[in-house]
Structures are given as C-alpha cells and as structure tokens.
Interface confidence: low
C-alpha cells in the first residue's frame, strides 16, 4: 500500500549528508540487498563522508519504501542518537 508523504531519509536528506559519520556501516548493511557491488564500490571511492552520502543518495530515487526502511534501520543501528535528534526536529 502506498504511504503518504516523504520517507524519513528523504525528509532529512541534507542533514544526513552533513551528519552521518559511519557510512561504512550503512554500506555493509545495504550491500547485496539494495546496493549492487558497483554501487557499493562507487560510494566507498568517494573521499569524504558527505560525498559518500551524496553518492548513496544518488541511488535512492530507484528505491521503494521498504528499501529506504533498510537504510533507516542501518542508521538507527549506527547513529541512533542522530535519528532520534532528527525525529524530534
């Protein structure tokens, strides 16, 4: 069933690009599920965390809600306090 509104990761795209520090964790969690090997390597090749996150977000337009939930779950595991902070904002 369709869900109204933007997904959390789309709502907070700018903040996530700026504030996520543990991109490797996200890649591990998403690899083989929503990220291909080529995409995984492309994100890892970026020099900074913000550029890694920008590259990761370049793939999300093709993801459905469930795929985005996987990213949110990985974020909750790696930087739970960041997710909680954004949920309050």
């Amino acid at each position: 069933a369709a869900k109204p509104g933007l997904h959390f990761i789309d709502q907070h795209r700018a903040a996530l690009i700026a504030r996520v520090t543990n991109v490797e964790w996200l890649l591990d969690a998403l690899y083989g599920k929503v990220l291909t090997d080529e995409q995984y390597q492309a994100v890892r090749a970026e020099p900074t965390n913000p550029s890694k996150m920008r590259k990761l977000f370049s793939f999300t337009p093709a993801w459905n809600w469930t795929c985005k939930d996987l990213l949110l779950q990985a974020l909750r595991e790696s930087q739970s306090y960041l997710v909680e902070d954004l949920e309050r904002s």
């Epitope: 490797e24 964790w25 591990d28 909750r76 595991e77 739970s80």
Partner: nanobody, 112 residues
Framework: QLQLVESGGGLVQPGGSLKLSCAAS????????MSWYRQAPGKERESVAR????????YYADSVKGRFTISREDAKNTVYLQMNSLKPEDTAVYYC?????WGQGTQVTVSS
C-alpha cells in the same frame, strides 16, 4: 539481558598508549558487528572504529587511522580498542556499541 562493560580508560600523557576492553553478555556476540564511539565534552558522539562479525570488515574514523586498532576475541565475548600515539584531542568518554545498545563508557584523558 544485553550488557556491555567497558574498561581500560585512564589518564595518559600525549604520545602514550591505552587498551580499552568491552566485555559483552546477553547476546550471541560472534554474530554482531561491534563498534567504539567517543564523546568529548560539548561535542557530538562520534564513531571511532567498527569491526564486523568475523572481523572481516574494519572501519576507522579518519582522525584515528594508523593510531587505533580494533579487534575482537569471540571466545571471550570481548572487543578491544588499542590506542597508540594518543593526542589531547583524543580525550573523551569512549563507548562500546552494538545494535542500539551502549555501554556506560570509560573516560580517556590525554594530558601532560
């Protein structure tokens, strides 16, 4: 009940070393990635190092690469953080983390 207990913190001079330990219980340790985070006064908690289950994937924050080493001993349900060439900016409370759970933290102070 899941429990994470850190130890090994203390006061050390710049250039010195410390080895932190995190003893885990209440879950199947070998199946989970384990992480170390730190939080300095007035700053956001930041990721320091992470080791995957099996130890095949290791991540380090840029600020500690080449100085810190994370390792795990599944037989002892323990993850370690060996910290060498410590700097004053490494002063923080260091936390062990797994899947939404945090330890109580151990204070590391680097000062002459």
């Amino acid at each position: 009940q899941l429990q994470l207990v850190e130890s090994g913190g203390g006061l050390v001079q710049p250039g010195g070393s410390l080895k932190l330990s995190c003893a885990a219980s209440g879950f199947t340790f070998s199946r989970y990635a384990m992480s170390w985070y730190r939080q300095a006064p007035g700053k956001e908690r930041e990721s320091v190092a992470r080791i995957s289950s099996g130890g095949g994937t290791i991540y380090y924050a840029d600020s500690v690469k080449g100085r810190f080493t994370i390792s795990r001993e599944d037989a002892k349900n323990t993850v370690y953080l060996q910290m060498n060439s410590l700097k004053p900016e490494d002063t923080a409370v260091y936390y062990c983390y797994v899947g939404g759970f945090w330890g109580q933290g151990t204070q590391v102070t680097v000062s002459s």
